[in-house]
Amino acid sequence: QLSLPSILPNENEKVVQLNSSFSLRCFGESEVSWQYPMSEEESSDVEIRNEENNSGLFVTVLEVSSASAAHTGLYTCYYNHTQTEENELEGRHIYIYVPDPDVAFVPLGMTDYLVIVEDDDSAIIPCRTTDPETPVTLHNSEGVVPASYDSRQGFNGTFTVGPYICEATVKGKKFQTIPFNVYALKATSELDLEMEALKTVYKSGETIVVTCAVFNNEVVDLQWTYPGEVKGKGITMLEEIKVPSIKLVYTLTVPEATVKDSGDYECAARQATREVKEMKKVTISVHEKGFIEIKPTFSQLEAVNLHEVKHFVVEVRAYPPPRISWLKNNLTLIENLTEITTDVEKIQEIRYRSKLKLIRAKEEDSGHYTIVAQNEDAVKSYTFELLTQVPSSILDLVDDHHGSTGGQTVRCTAEGTPLPDIEWMICKDIKKCNNETSWTILANNVSNIITEIHSRDRSTVEGRVTFAKVEETIAVRCLAKNLLGAENRELKLVAPTLRSELTVA
């Protein structure tokens, strides 16, 4: 840590005679520079040079050959490496006065006559005298304004909006400044910053637009940081809205975006007069071309129970916005002819949700359903098969006897989805068939009895059982069952000998 440079003469302030010469020496442990009141254009009679000495210190001399009122002000000696744009200069100061009977006030630039005040904050009206002994008064349209005066700075106080004039008398001669205009700016202690990107997803060639709005604040500096900045891409705009309240709208426009323009877009607002900073960020993605992704929330084979209400939901990610349609067996779904409805809902900027709704499922609703999403750059589809599940029911139970051989076949026709299983049961003691315990399942491996099953179509099945010889009356039961239910029917098989006796009778 270097100690502050030192100045010779070692004084806080010094009064220098008009037109005389003066020099200020600065000593430091590292390279030092001078900051002085005048701009470079005005400083033709200010000479700065480095001086060698044996102390091991760096010495820089500021010399003025002919002092004038314009040389009045603060001279600061500082280490070169410590100067930053943001911070006030750290160094050693000396204030020089050059009294001039014809110039009571230090000459100022035009911008110095505009005094910006934040709300009810104090401000400085910078009329500085060339002579520290000169009495000064401040006036506005109402008369003398009470305010504290410092010849190094000017009048300090809380001022209302309007023009102010500084007045001084030097050796009986009255001097007046041109009016200082106090202008009030709206500024809050906190920054209310809002960022808006109507879109965050683009494709190549489109124009990115991001806005940041600052509310109730006029003293704002806003900087954009974004990927295209390094290529000098992007055009800014500032719009000031005064009604119903103050709003500064900053817009960044990036025409003809490319994939390289993807990334974080950040606006950082800083209050020009206070160390108040606020940042907002949005992530923008630019795609080479449009895209579509389909994400179903169900499988490629789905089942619905008869009369059930069921929804099939498909998530779609797409840009640009897609057209979404549904097909059944490759034909467009005509909703008003069926109890099937579809809808599309936008969930987020590029996320959509499409629903296929079955209101009361019917057998004819079974089939292949396809969702198709398309935009100008892509087409995607997803197909699933829907089965309407119908409880099994027996359509027919008949017997068929084989004449003289005494054999008999029983046929049981059943329908349902999924296709029913058929089981056979037999009751040999006809008098006890009311009792469930009298029924036994007919096994496939029983001799003289053959069971077989044939699918007639997608939802109809026929089961057959053939008895080689029926010697006594038995009862046969067909049991058709699937996931949704079971149904059974019974049939009596009479032995051929008994049948002939009955016939004679």
């Epitope: 060639g205 124009t207 891409k233 800014t236 500032l238 025409p255 003809e256």
Partner: antibody, heavy 121, light 107 residues
Amino acid sequence: EVQLVESGGGLVQPGGSLRLSCAASGFTFSSYSMNWVRQAPGKGLEWVSYISGSSTTMYYADSVKGRFTISRDNAKNSLYLQMNSLRDEDTAVYYCARLRHFDWSYAFDIWGQGTMVTVSS
Amino acid sequence: DIQMTQSPSSVSTSVGDRVTITCRASQGISSWLAWYQQRPGKAPKLLIYAASSLQSGVPSRFSGSGSGTDFTLTISSLQPEDFATYFCQQATSFPFTFGPGTKVGIK
């Protein structure tokens, strides 16, 4: 050959309307932002309006905001400027100009020959 | 809005002369500046973009320099076809603004 050709200018009374057209050829029109720039007789250039390639973004100079509307038809390679409530100070040669991004800058690299609009009673 | 000023407003010179036109922006615009040439009765023509880059097809006697707020267009050796009005334009911020122009005339 890359070319812009304006049409639709003429004499119109204050308060009247006019629609300017600009036909583009020789480049992929939809890939570029387009602009209208005007020049009053004996005066400098004044930017009037901007439209992005896909017509999603439009900007206007304060002097024409609310009165002029910029539009484009990429299928027809055409740019338009609908001018309503015309004033004497709108009298100028109107140029359509292509905005191009170069590294570290934007510039109007292609200009039309201009069309004269005279607002007078 | 960013104001653009140009100096001189006009200059009378001869073929073969070196001509320098300056353009100043009311606030820093980095190198987002273009220069245009406009001959009487014609549309403007882009000469320089990004403050110092020569547009293709433009003779190398034209050059641009500067950054921030102060920019210069130089014509190293004036040719008869260079007698025209020259405009600078900032392209960093809407509304795009042009300088008032500098007329280069024959002495």
